[in-house]
């Protein structure tokens, strides 16, 4: 029995496997910073994790998803203040007892070295130098992301 998140992920993957021409984001919108194929927006107000998630959604974006350690380092290089923490799109799934990205995938244990406990109501934040487990109710800043894609982007199965 698949969860609703898993079903959604399957649907998304199936639609990606079709040959499509879809409109995309050629350049980062004003106030968004380009990092490779993404646009990032660093908030300067604070919110608990859930509100941060909702804010990114209103901006037609998502909380930051980090693919690997290299992307983490490049993101951290954009953080100019050592003392500031930012929410990303990763929290602890109690039912699966694992860190889960908001796109439904699980954290590869080698990707991030998390300081703190993996437990209920824990969400992940990043600073200039580290990755932390924090209570999701903690009010800190957050990072939203938009994917940069070519305007004419033909997608082929298994490409």
């Amino acid at each position: 029995q698949k969860s609703s998140i898993e079903k959604c992920s399957v649907d998304i993957q199936q639609s990606r496997n079709k040959t499509t021409e879809r409109p995309g984001l050629l350049n980062c919108p004003i106030y968004w910073q380009q990092l490779r194929e993404k646009c990032l927006l660093f908030s300067h107000t604070v919110n608990p994790w859930n509100n941060s998630l909702a804010d990114c959604s209103t901006k037609e974006s998502s909380l930051l998803l980090i693919r690997d350690k290299d992307e983490l380092i490049h993101t951290q290089n954009l953080i100019r203040d050592k003392a500031i923490l930012f929410w990303i799109g990763l929290n602890f799934s109690l039912s699966e007892k694992n860190w889960k990205w908001i796109n439904g995938s699980f954290l590869n244990s080698n990707d991030l070295e998390i300081r703190g406990d993996a437990k209920e109501n824990s969400c992940i934040s990043i600073s200039q130098t580290s990755v932390y487990s924090e209570y999701c109710s903690t009010e800190i800043r957050w990072i939203c992301q938009k994917e940069l894609t070519p305007v004419r982007n033909k997608v082929y199965p298994d490409s």
């Epitope: 300067h44 100019r80 203040d81």
Partner: antibody
Framework: QVQLQESGPGLVKPSETLSLTCTVS????????WSWIRQTPGKGLEWIGY???????NYNPSLKSRVTISVDTSKNQFSLRLSSVTAADTAVYYC??????????WGQGTLVTVSS | EIVLTQSPGTLSLSPGERATLSCRAS???????LAWYQQKPGQAPRLLIY???SRATGIPDRFSGSGSGTDFTLTISRLEPEDFAVYYC????????FGGGTKVEIK
């Protein structure tokens, strides 16, 4: 309460560079976007550009070739430089805290006249 | 660039009356990224509304914003003497541009 104060010469000669500084008090300049806006009787309010730390800046396309905005976090200040000025650049110049697109705190404004 | 046209240019009303100010965009404003400001002579503009309808901190509830796409409205439900001023709309969905302003004067 965040307060902003513009400072700089009130008179600039044509073809020279206009330089203004905005000092922020009552809060840290770090982690926020900061903008310059000007107001003329002819063109009304016109956004000039913003700075975010020193990693990101963006300028009004119509002024982009002449504008530089910089920040000095140690002094809690940010600055505007507008080169090759003409009489059309005569305006009241405001600095403001930029909430990624709208402006919640403004300086009181400083009149800059371009004249020989 | 998105051009914002405000109407009317001048609105002559009495205290206690309702003021309706219009701001029309030359193209759709993304995500209702529109703000309203009040400016009095010799002062800087003051933020009233952002996101088309959210009141800024400390702004009385007689000020309300509405609209989406290309048509936006600022309503002052009951004019107080201190509300007579010039009002500007500003979009921040695509670069940043301001409207030409509407002057609300005492009739």
């Amino acid at each position: 309460q965040v307060q902003l104060q513009e400072s700089g010469p009130g008179l600039v000669k044509p073809s020279e560079t206009l330089s203004l500084t905005c000092t922020v008090s009552g809060g840290s300049i770090s982690g926020y976007y900061w903008s310059w806006i000007r107001q003329t009787p002819g063109k009304g309010l016109e956004w000039i550009g913003y700075i975010y730390y020193s990693v990101s800046s963006n300028y009004n396309p119509s002024l982009k070739s002449r504008v530089t905005i910089s920040v000095d976090t140690s002094k809690n200040q940010f600055s505007l430089r507008l080169s090759s000025v003409t009489a059309a650049d005569t305006a009241v110049y405001y600095c403001a805290r930029d909430e990624t697109g709208y402006f919640d705190y403004w300086g009181q404004g400083t009149l800059v006249t371009v004249s020989s | 660039e998105i051009v914002l046209t405000q109407s009317p240019g001048t609105l002559s009303l009495s205290p206690g009356e309702r003021a309706t100010l219009s701001c029309r965009a030359s193209q759709s404003v993304r995500s209702s990224y529109l703000a309203w400001y009040q400016q009095k002579p010799g002062q800087a503009p003051r933020l009233l509304i952002y996101g088309a309808s959210s009141r800024a901190t400390g702004i009385p509830d007689r000020f309300s914003g509405s609209g989406s796409g290309t048509d936006f409205t600022l309503t002052i439900s009951r004019l107080e003497p201190e509300d007579f001023a010039v009002y500007y709309c500003q979009q921040y969905g695509s670069s940043l541009t301001f409207g030409g302003g509407t002057k609300v004067e005492i009739k």
